[in-house]
Interface confidence: low
C-alpha cells in the first residue's frame, strides 16, 4: 500500500491556445486530469488501473503551481494504491480548459483539451522526487513525481506491514525496511524482553521492565551479585548463598566470636594502627617518629644518621640540623674540601687519594664504617633476631624483642600454639612449624572446627531444569535458583512462552 505523488510546478501556454490551435476566451482556465496505470510499452487509452485524479482550475495560460501540501491542498496530487508497487508505471497528464465551473468530462466541449503528455518507465519507492519537463509545440509542463509507502507499510515495494507498538506484545518502532527497531530498554525478536539494569547478574537477577534488577532467592544488592549469607551470620561473608565464611578475627558458626587480638589487647602504642594477621597475631603500623614492635620507642629524626662525613646531627623542633666537621659543608655535610694531607679518616682508617689528590676515600678497619670511618658498625645490621623479632641496640650489647608466640635470646624458640586450646567443639590441636592444625570431630569443619557441617539437602538433586541448589544451614533445607524461563520451588514450571507472531 502506498501513494504515487505528482507535484505540478509550472505550466507554460504563452499563446493561450487549445490543442486544436483555437485560442481560449478570454484565456485558458487550466485544470489537469491525471491517469496512472500499469506499464505499457506504448501508452494507450483504457482503464486507469492504478487510479485517476483531477485538479481544480489552477491558473490561466502560464502559471506556477504552489506547493499546497502543508495546508492540506491538492499539490502534490495523491494517487493511492493498495497493492505491491510493481516498480513500473504509465502516466497520462491532460491539461484542459474549463469555460465554466463544471469540470466533469461530459460538461466540457470535446475540443477543450489544451495538451496531453504520456510517459512510462521504472520508478522505485523513495523520498526523492523525479523531476521532468515535457514540451509540446505550444506548451511546456514542469512537474515532479515519486512513490512513497502508506503509513505502516515499508520495503522496496511497500509490501511489508509494520505497525509500531508499545505494549505486552512488543515495544518497537519500524525501520525504513520494515524491520523492527526496539525501543530503548527492550530486546528480543519482537522486543518483548526487557533489558535489565546495566550489570544486573545474568543468573542471579532478572527483570520485568527495563533498567530493573530483581534478585532470585539467595541473592541481594543493586545488581543481585551479592549472596545472602547464612541466617544469623554476624561477621562473615559468602561466595554462594547461605554460607558464613568468617571475616579475619572472627570465629564460630555465625562468626560472632571475636578473635581480634587488636580489639581485645590494644597492643599498639602512640596512636599506631593495629592490623590482625591471624589468631593472636598482629602488626603495628607506627606513626612518624616512633618505632618498635608495638611502636613504643620514640624515634629521633637523627636516628637515621642523615649527616655524612662525621657530621653530628642535632634535633630541631621540625627536623634536624647537621654540624659538619672541618673541610665539609652542605645540608648533610656531603661536600668535601679535604684531602689525605688533612688526615680525614678516623678510627685507624687509611686514606687513599683519588682524582690526582682532588679528593680521597677512606678504607675502614673492622667494626667501623662511613665515608670517614666515623661510624661504629650497628650490631643490629646483621639482623640476628629470628621469626620477625626486632633488634634493639642497648648500650654495648643488643637484645631481641620477640613477636607473640616466640621466645629465646634471638626469638628462635616457638611457644606452643596449642597451649591456648584454640580448636572449637572438641577438635584436636597439633603444633606445626608455622602454626597449628585442628583435627575436627564429625559434624564440624573449618580452620578451628568452628563451622557446623549440616546434612546436605542438595545431595538428592531436588532442582529441575539445570537450576542451582543451595543448602540452608539453619533449617537443613534446600533452595533452588531457577534459570531464566523457569519458576517454582524446584524450578519445575516453564514461564508461559510468547505467541509465535504477535501481530
Amino acid at each position: 500500500s502506498g501513494v504515487f505523488q505528482l507535484q505540478l510546478q509550472e505550466f507554460i501556454n504563452e499563446r493561450g491556445v487549445l490543442a486544436s490551435g483555437r485560442p481560449c476566451e478570454p484565456g485558458c482556465r487550466t485544470f489537469f486530469r491525471v491517469c496512472l496505470k500499469h506499464f505499457q510499452a506504448v501508452v494507450s487509452p483504457g482503464p486507469c488501473t492504478f487510479g485517476t485524479v483531477s485538479t481544480p482550475v489552477l491558473g490561466t495560460n502560464s502559471f506556477a503551481v504552489r506547493d499546497d501540501s502543508s495546508g492540506g491542498g491538492r499539490n502534490p496530487l495523491q494517487l493511492p494504491f493498495n497493492f505491491t508497487w510493481p516498480g513500473t508505471f504509465s502516466l497520462i497528464i491532460e491539461a484542459w480548459h474549463a469555460p465554466g465551473d463544471d469540470l466533469r468530462p461530459e460538461a466540457l466541449p470535446p475540443d477543450a483539451l489544451i495538451s496531453k503528455i504520456a510517459i512510462q518507465g521504472s520508478l522505485a519507492v523513495g523520498q526523492n522526487w523525479l523531476l521532468d519537463e515535457q514540451t509540446s509545440t505550444l506548451t511546456r509542463l514542469r512537474y515532479s513525481y515519486r512513490v512513497i509507502c502508506s503509513d505502516n507499510y515499508y520495503g522496496d515495494n511497500c509490501s511489508r506491514l509494520c505497525k509500531k507498538r508499545n505494549d505486552h506484545f512488543g515495544h518497537y518502532v519500524c525501520q525504513p525496511d520494515g524491520n523492527l527497531s526496539c525501543l530503548p530498554g527492550w530486546t528480543g525478536e519482537y522486543c518483548q524482553q526487557p533489558i535489565c539494569l546495566s550489570g544486573c547478574h545474568e543468573q542471579n537477577g532478572y527483570c520485568s521492565k527495563p533498567a530493573e534488577c530483581l534478585c532470585r532467592p539467595g541473592w541481594q544488592g543493586r545488581l543481585c551479585n551479592e549472596c545472602i549469607p547464612h541466617n544469623g551470620c554476624r561477621h562473615g561473608t559468602c561466595s554462594t548463598p547461605w554460607q558464613c565464611t568468617c571475616d579475619e578475627g572472627w570465629g564460630g558458626l555465625f562468626c560472632d566470636q571475636d578473635l581480634n587480638y587488636c580489639t581485645h589487647h590494644s597492643p599498639c602504642k602512640n596512636g599506631a594502627t593495629c592490623s590482625n594477621s591471624g589468631q593472636r597475631s598482629y602488626t603495628c603500623t607506627c606513626r612518624p617518629g616512633y618505632t618498635g614492635v608495638d611502636c613504643e620507642l620514640e624515634l629521633s629524626e637523627c636516628d637515621s644518621n642523615p649527616c655524612r662525613n662525621g657530621g653530628s646531627c642535632k634535633d630541631q623542633e621540625d627536623g634536624y640540623h647537621c654540624l659538619c666537621p672541618p673541610g665539609y659543608y652542605g645540608l648533610h655535610c656531603e661536600h668535601s674540601t679535604l684531602s689525605c694531607a688533612d688526615s680525614p679518616c678516623f678510627n685507624g682508617g687509611s686514606c687513599r687519594e683519588r682524582n690526582q689528590g682532588a679528593n680521597y676515600a677512606c678504607e675502614c678497619p673492622p667494626n667501623f664504617t662511613g665515608s670517614n670511618c666515623e661510624k661504629k658498625v650497628d650490631r643490629c645490621t646483621s639482623n640476628p633476631c629470628a621469626n620477625g623479632g626486632q633488634c634493639l641496640n642497648r648500650g654495648p650489647s643488643r637484645m631481641c624483642r620477640c613477636r607473640p608466640g616466640f621466645t629465646g635470646t634471638y626469638c628462635e624458640l616457638h611457644v606452643s600454639d596449642c597451649a591456648r586450646n584454640p580448636c572449637a567443639h572438641g577438635g584436636t590441636c597439633h603444633d606445626l612449624e608455622n602454626g597449628l592444625m585442628c583435627t575436627c570431630p564429625a559434624g564440624f569443619s573449618g580452620r578451628r572446627c568452628e563451622v557446623r557441617t549440616s546434612i546436605d539437602a542438595c545431595a538428592s538433586s531436588p532442582c529441575f531444569n539445570r537450576a542451582t541448589c543451595y543448602t540452608d544451614l539453619s533449617t537443613d533445607t534446600f533452595v533452588c535458583n531457577c534459570p531464566y524461563g523457569f519458576v517454582g520451588s524446584r524450578c519445575e514450571f516453564p514461564v508461559g512462552l510468547p505467541p509465535s507472531f504477535p501481530w
Epitope: 506556477a64 526523492n128 523531476l131 515532479s144
Partner: antibody, heavy 122, light 108 residues
C-alpha cells in the same frame, strides 16, 4: 552535507571562451535543478540560466542566448557553464546555485558554489 | 520580465538599531519573493523565502512581510555581523529569475 565546488579563477582575452565547472556532492545530483548567476565587480546579481541535471535540458536568460552553453556529466555529478565571445563586461564572479523545490524554499537558492572569478582583459 | 526595485540603495545604522529594507516589483509576484544576504568575497546566503518564511538556521531577528508588489525585510536589532548587502529575488514569472539591485546596510 550539500557541497558545490567550482573550478578556479580564469583570465581570458576578448573573443575567447571560458568553461566553468561546478561539482556537486552530498545529495542525489539528478534530483535538483542547477542555476548559474553572475556578479560583476561592485554590481548586483544577474541570473544566467538553468539546467536540469536529470535530462540535461536548459533555459537561458535572453541576454546570454547564443553565447552561453550549460551541460552536465552525471558520472561525475558536475555541471558546466561555457560562455563564448567574451568581452570586458563579462568580467565577473560566476556562481552555480542549487534550486530548492521540495516543500520548503521552493525555487530559491539555498546552496551556492564558492564562485569563480573570470577576468576578460586584453 | 519582472523588475525588482530596492530602496534605499544604502542604509547607515548603528548596531542595535532596527533596519527596514524595501523591495517593489513591477508587477504582482504573489508571495514568491526571497531575500538574500551577501558579504564581501562570499556567495549570497538565503534569509527569507516565500516573502515571510525564515530559511534554516536564520536568526529570529530577520523577518519578511508583504505580497503582490510591495515587500519588506526587517532586522529587528542589528548585530555587527548583519552589515552587508541584501538582495530580493522573485520566482513568480520565469525565465528569468530576477534580483533587485541590492541595499547596502553599513555602520553609521
Amino acid at each position: 552535507q550539500v557541497q558545490l565546488v567550482q573550478s578556479g579563477a580564469e583570465v581570458k582575452k576578448p573573443g575567447a571562451s571560458v568553461k566553468v565547472s561546478c561539482k556537486a556532492s552530498g545529495y542525489t545530483f539528478t534530483s535538483y535543478y542547477m542555476h548559474w548567476v553572475r556578479q560583476a565587480p561592485g554590481q548586483g546579481l544577474e541570473w544566467m540560466g538553468i539546467i536540469n541535471p536529470s535530462g540535461g535540458s536548459t533555459s537561458y536568460a535572453q541576454k546570454f542566448q547564443g553565447r552561453v552553453t550549460m551541460t552536465r556529466d552525471t558520472s561525475t555529478s558536475t555541471v558546466y557553464m561555457e560562455l563564448s565571445s567574451l568581452r570586458s563586461e563579462d568580467t565577473a564572479v560566476y556562481y552555480c546555485a542549487r534550486e530548492e523545490y521540495s516543500g520548503s524554499s521552493a525555487e530559491y537558492f539555498q546552496h551556492w558554489g564558492q564562485g569563480t572569478l573570470v577576468t576578460v582583459s586584453s | 520580465e519582472i523588475v525588482l526595485t530596492q530602496s534605499p540603495a544604502t542604509l547607515s545604522l548603528s548596531p542595535g538599531e532596527r533596519a527596514t529594507l524595501s523591495c517593489r516589483a513591477s508587477q504582482s509576484v504573489s508571495s514568491y519573493l526571497a531575500w538574500y544576504q551577501q558579504k564581501p568575497g562570499q556567495a549570497p546566503r538565503l534569509l527569507i523565502y516565500d516573502a515571510s518564511n525564515r530559511a534554516t538556521g536564520i536568526p529570529a531577528r530577520f523577518s519578511g512581510s508583504g505580497s503582490g508588489t510591495d515587500f519588506t525585510l526587517t532586522i529587528s536589532s542589528l548585530e555587527p555581523e548583519d552589515f552587508a548587502v541584501y538582495y530580493c529575488q522573485q520566482r513568480s514569472n520565469w525565465p528569468p529569475w530576477t534580483f533587485g539591485q541590492g541595499t547596502k546596510v553599513e555602520i553609521k
